[in-house]
Interface confidence: low
């Protein structure tokens, strides 16, 4: 069921009222402020590292900067999962981890971050500018995905290598609509506050009714409407396509991290230089009830859920082998 922030109907202030800020108009700034504060967009950061000593070995680390509880993490390469990318690992906080070669080890690092080691040798390893994507399904934020790759540079001294301009897809009209309303609201709130700053302090008029303070609530589409959703994502263009992964040669670059997207304050401390593209990962509010874990992304008509996990009663522990078979 879709639930939205319940904002009381606001009538224009009566002419002649000093300050034009009756109790009803006072509600608006607080509602907008609540929306602005609670609508802080979660972010996903992705880091990709190639070991200098082991050029065919990649480490991908992903984290979720949000307050919700993570219900599933999907790591893919060659593009976002559901848009041509191939799944490398799926991590479920309770049912365990399933990974496919060339994933060597997927594991939870913290409650909101994971790491994945990819292994290959020579012609079988992924090429250096392969795109790796991480998608976090969380409640109530929904599904958020970001991608990163090793920038195509082999200069060991480069501390902040240039990253290609990300492509931002925003197919989800609902999210855009809500975002637009929130953005407009925040701007309007600032405008109101600025106007209010230059006016005498208003007198609060006693009201006969004291309506409950509105609560901003996240909305989640029902299962029935999921199929119509599209997951927006931020991704980096790469010249290495999934189809060529089997023959691509590894990039002989240094040991370093490429990060996207993140903020300096939230960056986990990596061992080397950082590259950052401060583009927040976009997401969709996707219901994850009853294992509808696959994103509602662009897919051929014959695709759907079906990400499979290894059920492990012991919880989130990495298991051996591409299918998590001990």
């Amino acid at each position: 069921m879709r639930t939205e922030a319940q904002v009381p109907a606001l009538q224009p202030p009566e002419p002649g009222l000093e300050g034009a800020m009756g109790h009803r108009t006072l509600v608006l700034p607080w509602v907008l402020l609540t929306l602005c504060v609670t609508a802080g967009t979660p972010e996903v950061w992705v880091q990709v590292r190639m070991e200098a000593t082991e050029l065919s070995s990649f480490t991908i680390r992903c984290g979720f900067l949000g307050s919700g509880s993570i219900s599933l993490v999907t790591v893919s390469w060659g593009g976002p999962n559901g848009a041509g990318g191939t799944t490398l690992a799926v991590l479920h906080p309770e049912r365990g981890i399933r990974q496919w070669a060339p994933a060597r080890q997927a594991r939870w690092e913290t409650q909101s971050s994971i790491s994945l080691i990819l292994e290959g040798s020579g012609a079988s390893s992924p090429c250096a500018n392969t795109t790796f994507c991480c998608k976090f399904a969380s409640f109530p934020e929904g599904s958020w995905e970001a991608c990163g790759s090793l920038p195509p540079s082999s200069d060991p001294g480069l501390s902040a290598p240039p990253t290609p301009a990300p492509i931002l897809r925003a197919d989800l009209a609902g999210i855009l609509g809500v975002s637009g309303v929130l953005l407009f609201g925040c701007v309007y709130l600032l405008h109101l506050l600025r106007r209010h700053k230059h006016r005498p302090a208003p007198r609060l008029q006693p009201s006969r009714t004291s309506p409950q303070a509105p609560r901003a609530r996240a909305w989640a589409p029902s299962q029935a409407s999921q199929a119509a959703l599209h997951v927006p994502y931020a991704t980096i263009n790469t010249s290495c396509r999934p189809a060529t992964l089997d023959t691509a040669h590894p990039h002989g670059g240094p040991s370093w991290w490429a990060s996207l997207p993140t903020h300096a304050a939230h960056r986990p401390q990596g061992p080397a230089a950082w590259a950052s593209t401060p583009i927040p990962a976009r997401g969709s509010f996707v219901s994850v009830e009853n294992g509808l874990y696959a994103q509602a992304g662009e897919r051929p008509p014959h695709t759907g859920p079906g990400l499979t996990l290894f059920p492990d009663p012991r919880g989130p522990r990495a298991m051996e082998g591409p299918l998590g078979v001990r």
Epitope: T86, W100, G120, S124, T303, G304, G306, L307, T308, F310
Partner: antibody
Framework: EVQVQQSGPELVKPGASVKISCKAS????????MHWVKQSHGKSLEWIGY????????GYNQNFKSKATLTVDISSSTAYMELRSLTLEDSAVYLC???????????????WGQGTLVTVSA | DIQMTQSPASLSVSVGETVTITCRAS??????LAWYHQKQGKSPHLLVY???NLADGVPSRFSGSGSGTQYSLKINSLQSEDFGDYYC?????????FGGGTKLEIK
């Protein structure tokens, strides 16, 4: 066009071993798991295990761990299953099947070989 | 291991009728389920995956439904080529297991 072609029928003695093959074509062999399934006469299907040609990674049903060994030859895009210490109960049709990867949706078997009949008889 | 219980074991119906085959998993498999059709002497053929998604080339008279532990395959207006054995299979982690099968016979 994706095709999965299996080797012909085998008649073997109890205690012996047999190696059957599954040749794939029409797709990138290294990118999809290849699974093996047993079907005894008039019975249901039993999953034996899989191999990932990319790096030879395998996973087995515990019931077949001591019975089957899965290997691949990437140069010929062929998967193999060796069955050892054969008994009469191992007489069955053995099928190989490619695991699909529909944009991240994996697990289902979308292309199957025609099956290899293994008969164990003294 | 997750066990798959398929019912009925056999079914005798006429062309044009509608049938429903059910599959119950011993644990939640989160829609990680496929349905296959197998004709005598042939290998299985994928019909449905992800519990509800029709595989390429499968006629629309087939439909899959269900979630959690209960799943079903419905065949509307049965055609002569639909007769044979039907199997469900879970792929929620290994070992993958199949249902016992449903034999669909012409009445």
């Amino acid at each position: 066009e994706v095709q999965v072609q299996q080797s012909g029928p085998e008649l073997v003695k109890p205690g012996a071993s047999v190696k059957i093959s599954c040749k794939a074509s029409g797709y990138t062999f290294t990118k999809s798991n290849m699974h093996w399934v047993k079907q005894s006469h008039g019975k249901s299907l039993e999953w034996i295990g899989y191999i990932y040609p990319y790096n030879g990674g395998t996973g087995y049903n515990q019931n077949f761990k001591s019975k089957a060994t899965l290997t691949v030859d990437i140069s010929s895009s062929t998967a193999y299953m060796e069955l050892r210490s054969l008994t009469l109960e191992d007489s069955a049709v053995y099928l190989c099947a490619r695991e699909a990867d529909y944009y991240g949706n994996r697990g289902q078997f979308d292309y199957w070989g025609q099956g290899t009949l293994v008969t164990v008889s003294a | 291991d997750i066990q798959m219980t398929q019912s009925p074991a056999s079914l005798s119906v006429s062309v044009g009728e509608t049938v429903t085959i059910t599959c119950r998993a011993s644990d939640n498999i989160f829609s990680n389920l496929a349905w296959y059709h197998q004709k005598q002497g042939k290998s299985p053929h994928l019909l449905v995956y992800g519990a509800t998604n029709l595989a390429d080339g499968v006629p629309s008279r087939f439909s899959g439904s269900g979630s959690g532990t209960q799943y079903s395959l419905k065949i509307n207006s049965l055609q002569s080529e639909d007769f044979g054995d039907y199997y469900c299979q879970h792929f929620w982690g290994t070992p993958y297991t199949f249902g016992g099968g449903t034999k669909l016979e012409i009445k």
